[in-house]
Amino acid sequence: KIDACKRGDVTVKPSHVILLGSTVNITCSLKPRQGCFHYSRRNKLILYKFDRRINFHHGHSLNSQVTGLPLGTTLFVCKLACINSDEIQICGAEIFVGVAPEQPQNLSCIQKGEQGTVACTWERGRDTHLYTEYTLQLSGPKNLTWQKQCKDIYCDYLDFGINLTPESPESNFTAKVTAVNSLGSSSSLPSTFTFLDIVRPLPPWDIRIKFQKASVSRCTLYWRDEGLVLLNRLRYRPSNSRLWNMVNVTKAKGRHDLLDLKPFTEYEFQISSKLHLYKGSWSDWSESLRAQTPEEEPTGMLDVWYMKRHIDYSRQQISLFWKNLSVSEARGKILHYQVTLQELTGGKAMTQNITGHTSWTTVIPRTGNWAVAVSAANSKGSSLPTRINIMNLCEAGLLAPRQVSANSEGMDNILVTWQPPRKDPSAVQEYVVEWRELHPGGDTQVPLNWLRSRPYNVSALISENIKSYICYEIRVYALSGDQGGCSSILGNSKHKAPLSGPHINAITEEKGSILISWNSIPVQEQMGCLLHYRIYWKERDSNSQPQLCEIPYRVSQNSHPINSLQPRVTYVLWMTALTAAGESSHGNEREFCLQGKAN
């Protein structure tokens, strides 16, 4: 009821706390001499449910029967209306609609660690919409009982603050929770348990790992546990993996040997504990230990490729390239690569350690038979060397793959296809597809990429180091014993018309014709593989269509003759470049007048 109602009263029957669905009677009555002046018959009492008028009556009192109230609190306010004045509040009352508590379900108790305290949880059931008090009771041997009350509105957890000890681990304890509110009470089913049932060990701590003789095959995990722990489970995984390896151990006494760890791998280890084979629950997982396993000598062999370049009549340049071993093959940090170059007939050998690079270039005589061996070394040893005989990779014309094509395949991929060589295709032992960015200067510093393909394959998808709008020189090699044949093609993953045309840098006259020279378009403006150049010319100040000459693109070409110009006529000349996607804008314009005699 609203405190200190001077003008009248509001009463609620049977109670201001009711069960959902019940009916209540609300009475509003004026106190003596609190009605309208002059005529009490003019008293108009109005009953509001919050701000909505639900009933009115002329006189000293009003009765109203109310049904269908919702869960929660509803406020009723009684007001008096007199002629020629505002309504004034008389009094008010709240009605609280709720339900009796449901039986608490799934009561379960736990003691965290041997030194912890007993705490229980349960499911409350549906909200009562009323203040509901929960009392937890625990009874044990020798008529011992403990009780704890919960003052929290949504109570589903209580800690007794007592510790069960392992003196009699089979002794029974019984817990029960009772919910009480203004509309009733309900108790859970009793939950009976022993010390072993409810004690959940603390997670193991102080986890360490030791590798005997710095070897991954002799690894022991150590940890500390509470005294009564009987079982442990270990889980471990490489730090970059989502899948755990799981091991269960009994009576481990804080140590376990692990036999299947990979070398030079960061692992995450966690341990959990339990007091009894089939009673109680597992502890939480321990905090993670992260540790890197020791290195082992590399396995596998390097993938090695090479390029030969003619220098002069007596010397050639050999560039060797190799790919990093995979992490599982390297089995440690690769400290250096060992390259051995040997002349097979004379037996001369030269060895060099390479650090920080995966390539090596040297100059050797053009005579003799040369071989190289490359291996990778970490702190524990070296991989088996990859041996390669240096040969002329494109010498055997009959081994050259046929009908090589290169087509864009989605984003930043190129599909290279070919036909086997004319010479007995079964002689091919493997194909190598090699690609590098096309640089007009034939720059040998441009990184080289390659992949190996089985002899029965006639296509390869290249995607490593492929950029959009860049032209690649692609070669397909067919290798057979100490012979090789090759074919090449230009290809790009994505193209558009070049951003600019070639820049004409000189026009010279030679015997009645002219020679046009130009600068290559910068690589970043070519926007793919160039197919043609076009040279346009027309008479100065003429409105006629220009004539043109189309030249197939060749990497090193940067001049071309034209012999159809008339003497003593001034011409304007310009150039464009074309990819498969279209033609560039004009390059610069140059004027030229041929001085030669007219026919």
Epitope: G72, T73, L75, F96, D127, H129, K151
Partner: nanobody, 115 residues
Framework: QVQLQESGGGLVQPGGSLRLSCTAS????????MDWYRQAPGNQREWVAS???????YYDASVKGRFTISRDSAKMTVYLQMNSLKPEDTAVYYC?????????WGQGTQVTVSS
């Protein structure tokens, strides 16, 4: 034990605005309505506005359209935003938390509307 603490009252000119706050301690805030009442000198306390536990607002006719009640369950606070204030709104404003075990009242905050 629940305690309620109002704040935000003061002197304001007619037509002005004030925002009252009422902060509760104790966990029962979330299942009950919260109410604002006011008491002018010589009068009894009268109901101004209520907000249910689910956030539905209700207002007395004298303040409807000018006052707005709201609640922030995380902060256990109820607010009364009072706009277009009139001299007849002058009173001590109380917040109340009604429960079936009894009502909890704040100590009140004075609002004076005067030019």
């Amino acid at each position: 034990q629940v305690q309620l603490q109002e704040s935000g009252g003061g002197l304001v000119q007619p037509g002005g605005s004030l925002r009252l706050s009422c902060t509760a301690s104790g966990s029962i805030f979330s299942i009950y309505n919260m109410d604002w009442y006011r008491q002018a000198p010589g009068n009894q306390r009268e109901w101004v506005a209520s907000i249910t536990s689910s956030g539905d607002p209700y207002y007395d006719a004298s303040v409807k359209g000018r006052f707005t009640i709201s609640r922030d369950s995380a902060k256990m606070t109820v607010y009364l935003q009072m706009n277009s204030l009139k001299p007849e709104d002058t009173a001590v404003y109380y917040c109340k938390l009604p429960t079936e075990k009894g009502n909890y009242w704040g100590q009140g905050t004075q609002v004076t509307v005067s030019s």
